[in-house]
């Protein structure tokens, strides 16, 4: 069960996680950024590599608003999607449109989430309701996982990787804003 039991309207249901790195910087103008991440050292020969760490896959960054019932996040969140075929790291293109994706003829390597992070989002609700907040789990990094014919889809959920726990910082508690201010911001957000 774990976090999976938290069923969020506009957020993918994500299995429970360990710890997370710092969130990626928020994108400013809703542009999607695609980049191929290098997942390890280059292989000795592109078709002989056997070590998962020698494979890499693409991490796509994009921004979206989180919705919760009639409410919507005040700001978009930056989300990461694990995409594409895994291949030897040195053969992957640096950006979309440069180079060709390598397709393995042997074992199947799948690009799957590796680490997650939880991000608090402030929700703006219509009608001047009290400000509400929600925590969403977002993919923080991707990895290649080697699948054998004995693996099935459920075994892709291998997300127990631990990252350093971020320092617990305290910030002053934001005061509840007036209904008018809340409503105005909601209208502006749309």
């Amino acid at each position: 069960q774990g976090w999976q039991a938290f069923k969020n309207d506009a957020t993918e249901i994500i299995p429970e996680l360990g710890e997370y790195p710092e969130p990626p910087p928020e994108l400013e103008n809703n542009k999607t950024m695609n980049r191929a991440e290098n997942g390890g050292r280059p292989p000795h020969h592109p078709f002989e590599t056997k070590d998962v760490s020698e494979y890499s896959c693409r991490e796509l960054h994009f921004t979206r608003y989180v919705t919760d019932g009639p409410c919507r996040s005040a700001k978009p969140v930056t989300e990461l999607v694990c995409s594409g075929q895994c291949g030897p790291a040195r053969l992957l293109p640096n950006a979309i449109g440069r180079g060709k994706w390598w397709r393995p003829s042997g074992p199947d390597f799948r690009c799957i989430p590796d680490r997650y992070r939880a991000q608090r989002v402030q929700l703006l609700c219509p009608g001047g309701e009290a400000p509400r907040a929600r925590k969403v789990r977002l993919v923080a990094s991707c990895k290649c996982k080697r699948l054998t014919r004995f693996h099935n889809q459920s075994e892709l959920k291998d997300f127990g990787t631990e990252a350093a726990r971020p320092q617990k910082g305290r910030k002053p508690r934001p005061r509840a804003r007036s209904a008018k201010a809340n409503q105005a911001e909601l209208e502006n957000a749309y």
Epitope: F6, A130, K135, K171
Partner: antibody, heavy 118, light 107 residues
């Protein structure tokens, strides 16, 4: 498996304080909001407040403001609720609950009975 | 504070019956209402939030409706495990408040 395990029953004198603990397992407490709800014998539910363990943010019901303190230890994934200046009407079962929002209570502890009696 | 008034406070019904519980808010709470089920000696369990959204794993015989000040929880065909006390909760404005509860008993 998500589990919230609360500390045992307490008997307190009027004017004293009580501190109830709630150990969360199944996910890191810092990724949740922690809520406290109480229920007097034979009565309904009463929301006391919530806290965000990650940043120490809190929201308390005005009725308990100044008497309640909600804290967490993220290293042990344990939440605490301390209620001071106890009176007989504070006799109740105190529940911790957790969720991904500040407004709904997805998982609950088993409850801790606090009896205030002279 | 927003008052949530539930009715009836108790009702007797048989297995298979259709049961309706109502909750009236003292002011407009939009759709910010949740419903909980509580069995004797146990902690409450979340069933529905945002008036009509069923929590994952909750049987589809439970449904919620309403908006503004009037809300309804319906159990389309009462099952033996549904005999319990049901509470509505508003989260439109602080402090979050619960209704007084409706006890569903076996007839």
């Amino acid at each position: 498996q998500v589990q919230l395990v609360q500390s045992g029953a307490e008997v307190k004198k009027p004017g004293a304080s009580v501190k109830v603990s709630c150990k969360v397992s199944g996910f890191p407490i810092k990724d949740t909001f922690q809520h406290w709800v109480r229920q007097a014998p034979g009565k309904g539910l009463e929301w006391m407040g919530w806290s965000d363990p990650e940043i120490g943010d809190t929201e308390y019901a005005s009725k308990f403001q100044g008497r309640v303190t909600m804290t967490e230890d993220t290293s042990t994934d344990t939440a605490y609720m301390e209620l001071s200046s106890l009176r007989s009407e504070d006799t109740a079962v105190y529940y911790c609950a957790t969720g991904d929002t500040t407004y709904k209570f997805d998982f609950w502890g088993q409850g801790t009975t606090v009896t205030v009696s002279s | 504070d927003i008052q949530m008034t539930q009715s009836p406070s108790s009702l007797s019904a048989s297995v298979g019956d259709r049961v309706t519980i109502t909750c009236k808010a003292s002011q407009d709470v939009h759709t910010a209402v949740a419903w909980y089920q509580q069995k004797p000696g146990k902690a409450p369990k979340l069933l529905i939030y945002y008036t009509s959204r069923l929590l994952s794993g909750v049987p589809s015989r439970f449904s919620g409706s309403g908006s503004g000040t009037d809300f309804t929880l319906t159990i389309s065909s009462l099952q033996p495990e549904d005999f319990a006390t049901y509470y509505c909760q508003q989260y439109s404005d602080y402090p979050w408040t619960f209704g007084g509860g409706t006890k569903v008993e076996i007839k």
